[in-house]
Interface confidence: medium
């Protein structure tokens, strides 16, 4: 089959936005299936048209309504003939237009009077492409070949920059880059003590505006009274905006405040936030737990627990826990050192423990008391010890 691209030179240069029709003539085949290929890839689309000139002569068209840069490349047509693919000579399609930016100036944030650079690059065809820089509405410097780097010694306020690219087809303007001034960060806010124990406190906060410079760290300052002696100062890398304060004194009033810093320096401190650590749970278990059987049930008695340390605070009610081997169990809260136990099965063994509680929680359990179903009373000892009459 005779195959040729008609009416197209080896190089075809078209302006962006113009239509292009590539014609491919095929002779010596009755029903050619003409395929168009661009840069080695088949152009699969319904824009392809055919003229049957005669039984053995066809003209195929590839119609591009409005060419753009992405249409530029090497085109050819091809047909299958007897199992072999025959290809035409190629045509190089060049799309000319106003410059196309490959690099545009980016927004920046810089410290006052600090030097910085902006970059701009644009390409044709046609070449050459020259770059002109603008600072706001003022042209700065003469045309420079693309690519161009603008060196700025510094700014004292937010300033806008753009570049303009020129070639024989006209000019194109880049995006406008805003160069912002960096500043100290704003104070953090929403400072919350999220978890409290007797010796630890977890703190979380929201960062204020970063002053257009990355926040590097935050400082948590702790005192025992607002403005009093500093007990603790913790510097934490951020994010996350959290901190664990350790080794605090139980049942103590504290205040904390937070500030954060970027490369330019620290923010103001946020307002003081008061908090109080929890006291200690009781350290001692009730002693001498014993039982007295009566006709109406079982009376349990134990010795009063005296606070060992002031940090334990006032000791509150006692908690009594009992269980039987039939699975029955219960807990009682009693104010004194004596409890009347009901609702248990005298035919089953009974195990009883007691602890003293305060605002923090319950202290250690006493030694378990085993009341045997054979006993008229019980005594403290290992869970399976028995006392018989």
């Amino acid at each position: 089959a005779g195959l040729k691209l008609m009416g197209a030179p080896v190089k075809l240069t078209v302006s962006q936005g113009q239509p292009v029709k590539l014609n491919c003539s095929v002779e010596g085949m009755e029903e050619p299936d003409i395929q168009w290929v661009k840069d080695g890839a088949v152009v699969q689309n319904l824009d392809q048209l055919y003229i049957p000139v005669s039984e053995q002569h066809w003209i195929g068209f590839l119609s591009l309504k409005s060419v753009e840069r992405s249409d530029a490349g090497r085109y050819w047509c091809q047909v299958e003939d007897g199992g072999e693919t025959e290809i035409s000579q190629p045509v190089w399609l060049t799309v000319e237009g106003v410059p196309f930016f490959t690099v545009e100036p980016k927004d920046l944030a810089v410290p006052p009077n600090a030097p910085f650079q902006l970059s701009c690059e644009a390409v044709g065809p046609p070449e050459p492409v020259t770059i002109v820089w603008w600072r706001g509405t003022t042209k700065i410097g003469g045309p420079a070949p693309s690519p161009s780097v603008l060196n700025v010694t510094g700014v004292t306020q937010s300033t806008m920059f753009s570049c303009e690219a020129h070639n024989l087809k006209g000019l194109a303007s880049s995006r406008t880059a805003t160069v912002h001034l960096q500043a100290l960060p704003a104070a953090p806010f929403n400072i919350t003590v999220t978890k409290l124990s007797s010796s630890n406190a977890s703190v979380a906060w929201m960062p204020g505006a970063d002053g257009r410079a990355l926040l590097q760290s935050c400082t948590v300052q702790v005192t025992q009274a607002p403005g009093g002696w500093e007990v603790l100062a913790v510097v934490v890398p951020v994010p996350p905006f959290t901190c664990l304060l350790r080794d605090l004194v139980p049942a103590t009033n504290y205040s904390l405040r937070v500030r954060c810093a970027n490369a330019l320096g620290p923010s103001p401190y946020a307002d003081w936030v008061p908090f109080q650590t929890k006291g200690l749970a009781p350290a001692s278990a009730p002693q001498n737990l014993h039982a007295i059987r009566t006709d109406s049930g079982l009376i349990l008695e134990w010795e009063e627990v005296i606070p060992e340390a002031p940090l334990e605070g006032p000791l509150g009610p006692y908690k009594l826990s009992w269980v039987q081997d039939n699975g029955t169990q219960d807990e009682l809260t009693v104010e004194g050192t004596r409890a009347n136990l009901t609702g248990w099965d005298p035919q089953k063994d009974l195990i009883v423990r007691v602890c003293v509680s305060n605002a923090v929680g319950c202290g250690p359990w006493s030694q378990p008391l085993v009341v045997s179903s054979h006993d008229r009373a019980g005594q403290q000892g290992p869970p399976h010890s028995r006392t018989s009459w």
Epitope: V43, N45, L46, Q48, Y50, S63, S66, E68
Partner: antibody, heavy 125, light 108 residues
């Protein structure tokens, strides 16, 4: 004179299969593409798909891909539109259209200039 | 999937100019085609490749295209021009065709 003669269709139940045909005359069948266009009652035109001159390539609209099959028999100059499983929403008029070629003078693209009379496909339970 | 958007209806008095628009993201790169469909009939091609009039179509029919909008203009509309008008184009990759939703032209 270019003519596209389309087959008729009886009422079909949902789930049934169906093939409708479009026989071309008055021109060389392999000089042109055949496209299919749907028009639901009281609604607009919808491009369904097309088959190339020699039957080697088929294109489908996204809404019809996988739901219909377009084929052609060059020996009888007939194009076909086939459903494996009809749905009530397939009730419509279906046109076959000669397309994608040029007149012998090479001046007017015959984009959908020759239309068949249409085949009404009613699908109802 | 790709869509072409047309106004559902346009009304003009006889002798006035009717304009029917068709918008689609691929229209800067793909040609628009316009069809006229009268009640109970198959569609008829009126305009091809944005602005070329099919032979036998009255000169009052013209087409244009700018950016993502194609326009069919009927200068001095006649009562016999009352019909549904559809734009047609290709999706951006050229692999399927799309009709607009259609515009009902009423010539009062």
């Amino acid at each position: 004179e270019v003519q596209l003669v389309q087959s008729g269709a009886d009422v079909k139940k949902p789930g049934a299969s169906l093939t409708i045909s479009c026989q071309a005359s008055g021109y060389t069948f392999t000089d042109y593409w055949i496209s299919w266009v749907r028009q639901k009652p009281g609604k607009g035109l919808e491009w369904m798909g097309a088959i190339s001159r020699n039957g080697s390539t088929t294109y489908y609209g996204p809404s019809f891909q996988g739901h219909v099959t377009i084929s052609a028999d060059r020996s009888t100059a007939t194009a076909y539109l086939q459903w494996r499983s009809l749905e009530a929403s397939d009730t419509a008029m279906y046109y076959c259209v000669r397309s994608g070629g040029l007149t012998s003078g090479g001046t007017i693209p015959e984009y959908y200039q020759h239309w068949g009379p249409g085949t009404l496909v009613p699908v109802s339970s | 999937s790709y869509e072409l958007t047309q106004p559902p209806s346009v009304s003009v008095s006889p002798g006035q100019t009717a304009r029917i628009t068709c918008s689609g993201d691929a229209l800067p790169k793909k040609y628009a085609y316009w069809y006229q469909q009268k009640s109970g009939q198959a569609p008829v091609l009126v305009i091809y490749e944005d602005k070329k009039r099919v032979s036998g179509i009255p000169e009052r029919f013209s087409g244009s295209s700018s950016g993502t909008m194609a326009t069919l203009t009927i200068s001095g509309a006649q009562v016999e021009d009352e019909a549904d008008y559809y734009c047609y184009s290709l999706a951006v990759d050229g692999n399927y065709g799309v009709f607009g939703g259609g515009t009902k032209l009423t010539v009062l």
